[in-house]
Amino acid sequence: IWELKKDVYVVELDWYPDAPGEMVVLTCDTPEEDGITWTLDQSSEVLGSGKTLTIQVKEFGDAGQYTCHKGGEVLSHSLLLLHKKEDGIWSTDILKDQKEPKNKTFLRCEAKNYSGRFTCWWLTTISTDLTFSVKSSRGSSDPQGVTCGAATLSAERVRGDNKEYEYSVECQEDSACPAAEESLPIEVMVDAVHKLKYENYTSSFFIRDIIKPDPPKNLQLKPLKNSRQVEVSWEYPDTWSTPHSYFSLTFCVQVQGKSKREKKDRVFTDKTSATVICRKNASISVRAQDRYYSSSWSEWASVPCS
Amino acid sequence: RNLPVATPDPGMFPCLHHSQNLLRAVSNMLQKARQTLEFYPCTSEEIDHEDITKDKTSTVEACLPLELTKNESCLNSRETSFITNGSCLASRKTSFMMALCLSSIYEDLKMYQVEFKTMNAKLLMDPKRQIFLDQNMLAVIDELMQALNFNSETVPQKSSLEEPDFYKTKIKLCILLHAFRIRAVTIDRVMSYLNAS
């Protein structure tokens, strides 16, 4: 058993048939010695009396908020949560496996630049009685500070018969140098509590590997005289690291017909303009990627040819 | 990536072309190592990230873009010392810091060159003959060093009398390639920045 936060404890349980469970002794936080009674959750029925209460925790129903009272007055609370281990593996029932980029990916993170700011998100089908708490650091032994906000519900989607909920959190490395060469990864730890079930999820990454620039901005077309060609121009996204001559991007320009089956013409360039042939009913799209370190491409920015 | 490769203009900052070739060569070598050594811990997640230049050079700090010198997190250990101009600085009014920066890059390349050559000698003794260093990568390091043209003592190649542990050597190769790729990215950024200045 260990303390998650003040008055909240996690009981780690090996889950198998006939498991003996864990004996837990709760002590009422009071100088009083006599006349103490114990209740569980919001029930008024007395479970036991005395300064300590011994319980055998075997399953979820044995957990909950144990309260000690004296003469109708609440003295202290202890909330017990369960962390379940089956066949040596901690349960991962609360979050959905996103399977990208590999199996058992519960947390996904992205950064728009090298400022040390990043966003992580996760999915669940659970809609109520759910809380998350996020901690992060650079490195695990002798960790350096990363500050994370509160996790918030960022999207809801319907997937078949199920509703899916996306939660996200923003974190910022306390003293980040955009030009630094990372040697220690960022560690992100998410504590998830659903009803009386506790689970924890972790992700480890370098900012350079989770970079995904915003799409190029101000995408414009300029027809060239006496030609089917157009000059496409764009700018670096506002959120990209500066100076741009140091944090350079490379671009992919695509001409796509109305039909998805039509052949796509693609040009790669390091410049912020390109000359392409604009077909009728086609659209021109541009996306960006770090020029020197091939992490993710941005989403496309698009304009119609007409 | 199937990018069309632009040939540099003659007037272009001379080292930019070499640094682009360097990054391409080390990325290809790393990819080859990861494929060939697929049953070894050779991915970014599996290896320990070591920097052989740590405490010996200060490329990131010395080559920091002017715009980032206001960022206190970038100024942990800025060095300000000596160094004479190399040929990459040809016909340019070069600041003291720029000379320091390019000299630091040169020292990095020299250290990696020695490590890679020593390692290659060991890998050539491996009866499995599983992996060797790409001669093109070694050549590209050499070319960039020549372009930088700093006067520096030559470091003798390390030789070891003991029987090499090929498993450890291959893991060390992965560690070295990962670190060198990261440094090659920094070098490319620096050259691009200097070219634009």
């Epitope: 889950w15 569980l40 919001q42 979820f60 044995d62 909950g64 | -």
Partner: nanobody
């Protein structure tokens, strides 16, 4: 999902005893409490007894206190209701129910899963 199957009901004389069983299967580890409710002819659903977890807490309706005992064999995922000193007014269909809710375990509206019920008749 949790499936519940009751057994052990039947006809018994006043003052007699019966033991009801409720076997749970499926995602039983998600359940917080298991309880017994009953419905007499022409009446609403009435709370009888509930057991929390593996038995850290048991709650009873006033009308059955001292006569009925709820217990659980966690290894068999089975909950029992031992009914002694039965009275005619205990005649009802007895339902086993399971909840994933921590609170209001005496209220049938908080229960997620129900068995099909077993008839208990107390008559001479």
């Amino acid at each position: 999902e949790v499936q519940l199957v009751e057994s052990g009901g039947g006809l018994v004389q006043p003052g007699g005893s019966l033991r009801l069983s409720c076997a749970a299967s499926g995602r039983t580890f998600e359940t917080i409490a298991m309880g017994w409710f009953r419905q007499a002819p022409g009446k609403g659903l009435e709370f009888v007894a509930v057991i929390r977890g593996s038995g850290v807490a048991t709650y009873y309706a006033e009308s059955v206190k001292g006569r009925f005992t709820i217990s659980k064999d966690s290894s068999k995922n089975t909950v029992y209701l031992q009914m002694n000193s039965l009275r005619a007014e205990d005649t009802a269909v007895y339902y086993c129910a399971a909840t994933t809710n921590r609170f209001k375990n005496r209220e049938y509206t908080t229960y997620d899963y129900w068995g099909q019920g077993t008839q208990v008749t107390v008559s001479s």
